[in-house]
Interface confidence: medium
């Protein structure tokens, strides 16, 4: 079958190879579309609500005034020429929209290196077939599931027009030390082939890189934090600041109902006390000032400590000293 | 830079309501756990509320039912509803959150007084 591409909306004619240019013609066209169950015959003789949906021309072709999506299908014609020869003609009719130029909406202006970021959504409306959404970064494609790169995609279809609306929300982690003004596009690729790409206009987001504050030092003795049970862990908050804040202890978040103190000591390590600690100094000049966390972890006889460790409950027997 | 602002603290009487607001700039907002902390005069500090990244809120148990945590990713903004306070209420309300590497983020504070 010869492949036919047809926009929607727009005509089509399909000729009947081997018909007699004028009538009398001996030529039966035969459908399989959405339109029809199996298979719909037409004569060049026509008449009936078909008409306004496809008919045959004088000359033996098939006309159909607009074609739409349930036009799609095989479309034959047989015919007879006056010397009694049979010819067949034989179409596969596929039908296409382009959308709109696709955009990109809910774009972020800034992005903050070393975390997920949405960088924004792509949207496509009015396509059909669906075709496809990607993502390009300074003009590269970019490939989801890679270096931080995730997207979540979804395809909606309209009711009434059978059309589809095409979503892309990209997401990225910035590297640390990268672009600071990088350039991301989104473009539609139809369905069909031949027809070419439509790109967004680029959206060009600032990269924030975060500062870590240096000011609150948190040392931990034994270094990594790692312990075996029964053990002693000695964790002092180190302030620059002069006079001297306040120190408050915080366990996976939740400050620890102790007096204020630069030292907290964990005696006789339990697997209550495991969990993520930070200090915190209160200043009456600004708002309090956290050091980074660290993860306090038991290691059974003949583990190797961690650096890191794991989340655990409240602790108990916790010493602040002041 | 990572800036929290808070803001909607001042006097109100027992029984009143306040909604505290803590604005973040420098950041992407929605995909951080957040959470108001409060510390009153000469006692220590102390956890009020948490919200985690998919938006499950915690509370404190001398809070729970008076105190609602609620955050606008739109607008970057956390909030704290406050209702039926109490003169124990009264304290500088921070809000806490937690960037990239592991490092935390305070605002500058807002006091809240109940009074009669």
């Known amino acids: 079958a010869q492949n036919i591409t047809a926009r929607i909306g727009e005509p089509l004619v399909l000729k009947c190879k081997g018909a007699p240019k004028k009538p009398p013609q001996r030529l039966e066209w035969k459908l399989n579309t959405g339109r029809t169950e199996a298979w719909k015959v037409l004569s060049p003789q026509g008449g009936g609500p078909w008409d306004s949906v496809a008919r045959v021309l004088p000359n033996g072709s098939l006309f159909l005034p607009a074609v739409g999506i349930q036009d799609e299908g095989i479309f034959r014609c047989q015919a007879m020429n006056r010397n009694g020869k049979e010819t067949k003609s034989n179409y596969r009719v596929r039908v296409y929209q382009i959308p709109g130029k696709p955009e990109i909406v809910d774009s972020a202006s800034e992005l903050t290196a070393g975390v997920p970021n949405k960088v924004g959504t792509c949207v496509s409306e009015g396509s059909y077939p669906a075709g496809t959404l990607s993502w390009h970064l300074d003009g590269k494609p970019l490939v989801p599931n890679e270096k931080g790169v995730s997207v979540k995609e979804q395809t909606r279809r309209h009711p009434e027009t059978g059309l589809f609306t095409l979503q892309s929300e990209l997401m990225v982690t910035p590297a640390r030390g990268g672009d600071p003004r990088p350039t991301f596009s989104c473009s539609f690729s139809p369905g069909l082939p031949r027809h070419r790409a439509l790109r967004t206009a680029p959206i060009q987001p600032r990269v924030w890189e975060p500062v870590p504050l240096e000011e609150v030092q948190l040392v931990v003795e034994p270094e990594g934090g790692a312990v075996a049970p029964g053990g002693t862990v000695t964790l002092t908050c180190e302030v620059p600041a002069q006079p001297s804040p306040q120190i408050h202890w915080m366990k996976d978040g939740v400050p620890l109902p102790l007096p204020p103190s630069p030292v907290l000591i964990l005696p006789e390590i339990g697997p209550q006390d495991q969990g993520t600690y930070s200090c915190v100094a209160t200043h009456s000049s600004h708002g309090p000032q956290e050091s980074r966390a660290v993860s306090i972890s038991i290691i059974e006889p003949g583990e190797e400590g961690p650096t890191a460790g794991s989340v655990g409950g409240s602790g108990l027997g916790t010493l602040a000293l002041a | 830079e990572v800036q929290l602002v808070e803001s909607g603290g001042g006097l109100v009487q027992p029984g009143g309501s306040l909604r505290l607001s803590c604005a973040a700039s420098g950041t992407i907002f929605s995909l951080n756990p957040m959470g108001w902390y409060r510390q009153a005069p000469g006692k220590q500090l102390e956890l009020v509320a948490l919200?985690?990244?998919?938006?499950?809120?915690n509370y404190a148990d001398f809070v729970r039912g008076r105190f609602t945590i609620s955050r606008d990713t739109t607008k970057k903004t956390l909030y704290l509803q406050m209702n039926s306070l109490e003169p124990e209420d009264t304290a500088v309300y921070y809000c806490r959150s937690t960037f990239a590497a592991g490092n935390f983020y305070w605002g500058q504070g807002t006091q809240v007084t109940v009074s009669s």
């Open positions: 919200i985690s990244d998919s938006g499950t809120a």
